[in-house]
């Protein structure tokens, strides 16, 4: 069975109303520009076959992909929210840098790969969708990692 290592975030990360609000505002701005409402990136399929104790590691992978492959290319858009939310998410990513699981992470990698492929396939609209789901990313990190 997978064993988690340091897959933990302090609850205080999620107790700052200002940055919570900015994250939600950024997600809302992007979701208004997203007209592909049938596709959900952070939803039932992402968590399928992954036990709750391994979901922080799963969300770490999604967070890192979102930062590197989505927020970086779109960093000029959705200001001023983007310039405030990216450092916050980077801080969470750094706090999870030692989060690993030893054991079978096949389901996790498969689910993350599916998410990445969906974003890539949709191109820029996939990136917009991922930004529009930052509220879900935020809540999922809180649920899984605290």
């Amino acid at each position: 069975l997978p064993v988690n290592t340091r897959c933990k975030l302090e609850v205080s990360n999620f107790q700052q109303p200002y940055i919570v609000n900015r994250t939600f505002m950024l997600a809302k701005e992007a979701s208004l520009a997203d007209n592909n409402t049938d596709v959900r990136l952070i939803g039932e399929k992402l968590f399928r076959g992954v036990s709750a104790k391994d979901q922080c590691y799963l969300m770490k992978q999604v967070l890192n992909f979102t930062l590197e492959d989505v927020l970086l290319p779109q960093s000029d858009r959705f200001q001023p929210y983007m310039q405030e939310v990216v450092p916050f998410l980077t801080k969470l990513s750094n706090q999870l840098s030692s989060c690993h699981i030893s054991g079978d992470d096949q389901n996790i990698q498969k689910n993350v790969r599916r998410l990445k492929e969906t974003v890539k396939k949709l191109g820029e609209s996939g990136e917009i969708k991922a930004i529009g789901e930052l509220d879900l990313l935020f809540m999922s990190l809180r649920n899984a990692c605290v």
Partner: antibody, heavy 121, light 111 residues
């Protein structure tokens, strides 16, 4: 088959306390966030409290914050709601509810039948 | 936190389509990524019929569909049937880590 069975309701005086329990079966309990939702007689649904899979986050409606405490015992497949300083407006049927899928407790896909709490002098 | 706003009642004849709206301030529902809809028959526990805005749980009829636009989420029931007569509630998870419900809509199937 997913089953949620609430217990612990009853009649209590204003200012009194009750502890509700929810016994879960038919699924891996510690893979899911859980909630308490209440419904006053003839009224709508009101979310009371929620807890994530490991008890690390516990959230409350403003109307019960400071008076109610949610907890879970994963070894016993049980969810609890400790209710203190009860008021007449807390009178309701209290449901235990599980997230539809692991990772999103706010989609309440499975519900117990509820346990009735009556606060009356 | 104020409840989301739903019409108190809607009605329709068998075979018709009806739509129930659910409106909230942007602070309540963010981008509406968290919207769920529940059906409740008298004396029964609520039943999840839409989650994640527009997804249907297995076993729920495809006559039920969900959507969002701006600050309003909607539930549409097509091909109305007598057994659809019930109370319907929308809900959303919020940026304050709470769940808010709408006040509920009583659906009457005429005839």
């Amino acid at each position: 088959e997913v089953q949620l069975v609430e217990s612990g309701g009853g009649v209590v005086r204003p200012g009194g306390s009750l502890r509700l329990s929810c016994a879960a079966s038919g699924f891996t309990f510690d893979d899911y966030g859980m909630n308490w939702v209440r419904q006053a007689p003839g009224k709508g649904l009101e979310w009371v409290s929620g807890v994530n899979w490991n008890g690390g986050t516990r959230d409350y409606a403003a109307s019960v914050k400071g008076r109610f405490t949610i907890s879970r015992d994963n070894a016993k497949n049980s969810l609890y709601l400790q209710m203190n300083s009860l008021r007449a407006e807390d009178t309701a049927l209290y449901h235990c509810a599980r997230g539809w899928y692991s990772g999103a407790a706010w989609n309440m896909g499975y519900w117990g039948r509820g346990t009735l709490v009556t606060v009356s002098s | 936190q104020a409840a989301l706003t739903q019409p108190a009642s809607v009605s329709g004849s068998p075979g018709q389509s009806i739509t129930i709206s659910c409106t909230g301030a942007s602070g309540d529902v963010g981008a509406y990524n968290f919207v769920s809809w529940y059906q409740q028959h008298p004396g029964k526990a609520p039943k999840l019929i839409i989650y994640d805005v527009n997804k249907r749980p297995s076993g729920v009829s495809n006559r039920f569909s969900g959507s969002k636009s701006g600050n309003t989420a909607s539930l549409t029931i097509s091909g109305l049937q007598a057994e659809d007569e019930a109370d319907y509630y929308c809900s959303s998870y919020t940026s304050t880590f709470s769940v808010v419900f709408g006040g509920g809509t009583k659906l009457t199937v005429l005839g």
